[in-house]
């Protein structure tokens, strides 16, 4: 079975050529090794003054840390030298090379390929915990729509295998602290919360530790409440139509709704010469409504076949859901067959049947 992920391991005093700008090289060194990072100028051109940075802080040269314009050397490396290293142009602060360095408590030896999130005791990497997938750890803020499932991951390893625990806003976090509980999967180094709600907002910290040390990562969860709304109808639909007597016409209505919408097509009519009732409500007749065999797609189209002069008038697409109703209207003009077709108003179309 293939192991699935790749992590490069470097032996003693190995000089590592820099990756292309924007790429992050992931490197593993053994305790006591000399870490050598090389960052040649892009395209071989002049580089200008550079600065080496570790975890966002400029490196100060010392007897142990040797800083050159294109090369960094850290002698007798220890676990504290693990971190994110970058070589930057001094003036622009543009990152030229980026390295993720991990120093294990045993001398490095060969490939360290972690297949999944699970850690294994290899007997080689004795010592403090470390992140096995550091490239996944930089997204600190997660904005999640309510009712979705969230998974926080802190894939790690160490020897002995570290334990993982979780905090919410700095305090121990257990299943009984939220309705619906939580799923802690220690082998996957993950915390799962189903169907999140606004009260789940906060800072979630994984603490990974063994007898050699402890590491932690904090994620901030924001839960986005979906504001329920009445159906939204696409602008410009249905459109005014001009058609020739005896032709076919289609009105279209595009409905967007989170809650299940109910769609109806109405035609405005006159009763005793009046278009509206005593309370100002228009008189309408229902032409099309949801039935057992009617799909949403079918309801978004009103088809009129072999139109007559009586079909002329105002048509309305009415869409409702549990929140409220929305409606758009359009007019149909029917022309005698022998007349020249005249252009409808800008929004309309002409159907010649």
């Amino acid at each position: 079975e293939s192991l699935g992920t790749e992590q490069r391991v470097v032996g003693r005093a190995a000089e590592v050529p820099g990756p292309e700008p924007g790429q992050q090289e992931q490197l593993v060194f053994g305790s006591g090794d000399a870490v050598e990072l090389s960052c040649p100028p892009p395209g071989g051109g002049p580089m200008g003054p550079t600065v080496w940075v570790k975890d966002g802080t400029g490196l100060v040269p010392s007897e142990r840390v040797l800083v050159g314009p294109q090369r960094l050397q850290v002698l007798n490396a220890s676990h504290e030298d693990s971190g994110a290293y970058s070589c930057r142009q001094r003036l622009t602060q543009r990152v030229l090379c980026h390295f993720s360095v991990r120093v294990t408590d045993a001398p490095s030896s060969g490939d360290d390929e972690d297949g999944e999130d699970e850690a294994e005791d290899t007997g080689v990497d004795t010592g403090a915990p470390y992140w096995t997938r550091p490239e996944r750890m930089d997204k600190k803020l997660l904005a999640v729509p309510a009712a979705n499932t969230v998974r926080f991951r802190c894939p790690a390893a160490g020897n002995p295998t570290p334990s993982i625990s979780w905090l919410k806003n700095g305090r121990e976090f257990r299943g009984e602290h939220r309705i619906g509980g939580i799923k802690l999967r220690h082998q996957q180094w993950s915390l799962v919360m189903e169907s999140v709600v606004p009260s789940d907002r906060g800072n979630y910290t994984c603490v990974v530790e063994n007898k050699f040390g402890s590491i932690r990562q904090t994620y901030t969860l924001d839960v986005l409440e979906r504001s329920p709304h009445r159906p939204i109808l696409q602008a410009g639909l249905p459109a005014n139509q001009t058609a020739v007597l005896g032709s076919d016409v289609e009105f279209h209505c595009k409905v967007y709704s989170d809650a299940q919408p109910h769609i109806q097509w109405l035609k405005h009519v006159e009763v005793n010469g009046s278009k509206v009732g005593p309370d100002g409500t228009p008189y309408v007749t229902v032409l099309k409504t949801a039935g057992a065999n009617t799909t949403d797609k079918e309801l978004e189209v009103l088809s009129l076949h072999n139109v007559t002069f009586e079909d002329a008038g105002e048509y309305t697409c009415l869409a409702g859901n549990s929140i409220g109703f929305s409606h758009h209207s359009a007019w149909l003009v029917v022309l005698p067959a022998e007349e020249e077709l005249v252009e409808a108003d800008e929004a309309g179309s002409v159907y010649a049947g």
């Epitope: 992050q24 980026h98 993720s100 999130d117 997938r133 550091p134 996944r136 930089d138 998974r151």
Partner: antibody
Framework: EVQLQQSGPELVKPGASVKMSCKAS????????MHWVKQSHGKSLQWIGY????????NYNQNFKDKATLTVNKSSTTAYMELRSLTSEDSAVYYC????????????WGQGTSVTVSS | DIQMTQSPSSLSASLGGKVTITCKAS??????IAWYQHKPGKGPRLLIH???TLQPGIPSRFSGSGSGRDYSFSISNLEPEDIATYFC?????????FGGGTKLEIK
């Protein structure tokens, strides 16, 4: 609206390399990992790997680690995949897909780039 | 790697009818399964994630269920635009794997 626009079809000779692109728009490019997936004719999809556009970190399927190289250009919000030492086995449609940050599923996909390896 | 066995590989159904597709994982995937619709020349479209959560804008005719190793996906009230290939994706661990796909045709 989230969109992933992939480069056009490629016809390449055995042993050559090819570099395809995936231009992202409608969201903050550096906030989401970008995955690459292979679809060979008559076979199920295969996950190749992903890249974190923010820090350039990558995670490859071991089966593709010697075949594919993933890179990004943050300024143009474009992800790239280069395939090397091409053989007829590499003839396929390749998709880029955005990983949803809060659960790991792939929520938006490009339309695919067809690669044909033929002499 | 986790293997995903999808069945059937193809099926034919009538308009207005209902179809069900299954995916079986080689180990427990803890409900981290997504279902996609794929039409020729287009990118796959996410329909359902985390077993049963409908993606916004996807009609409720689409549904999913399951747990452990066994998962299913259904389309009810079939419409002409449902003609496509459907596949599952497990994303339980950091090695994403796919089902073989099911080609849906309308009778």
């Amino acid at each position: 609206e989230v969109q992933l626009q992939q480069s056009g079809p490629e016809l390449v000779k055995p042993g050559a390399s090819v570099k395809m692109s995936c231009k992202a728009s409608g969201y903050t490019f550096t906030d989401y990992n970008m995955h690459w997936v292979k679809q060979s004719h008559g076979k199920s999809l295969q996950w190749i790997g992903y890249i974190n556009p923010n820090n350039g970190g990558t995670n490859y399927n071991q089966n593709f680690k010697d075949k594919a190289t993933l890179t990004v250009n943050k300024s143009s919000t474009t992800a790239y995949m280069e395939l090397r030492s091409l053989t007829s086995e590499d003839s396929a449609v390749y998709y880029c897909a955005r990983e949803r940050d809060y659960d790991g599923s792939m929520d938006f996909w490009g339309q695919g780039t067809s690669v044909t390896v033929s002499s | 790697d986790i293997q995903m066995t999808q069945s059937p590989s193809s099926l034919s159904a009538s308009l207005g009818g209902k179809v069900t597709i299954t995916c079986k994982a080689s180990q427990d995937i803890n409900k981290f399964i997504a279902w996609y619709q794929h039409k020729p020349g287009k990118g796959p479209r996410l329909l359902i994630h985390y077993t049963s959560t409908l993606q916004p804008g996807i009609p409720s005719r689409f549904s999913g269920s399951g747990s452990g190793r066994d998962y299913s996906f259904s389309i009810s009230n079939l419409e002409p635009e449902d003609i496509a290939t459907y596949f599952c994706l497990q994303y339980d661990n950091l090695l994403w794997t796919f089902g073989g796909g099911t080609k849906l045709e309308i009778k």
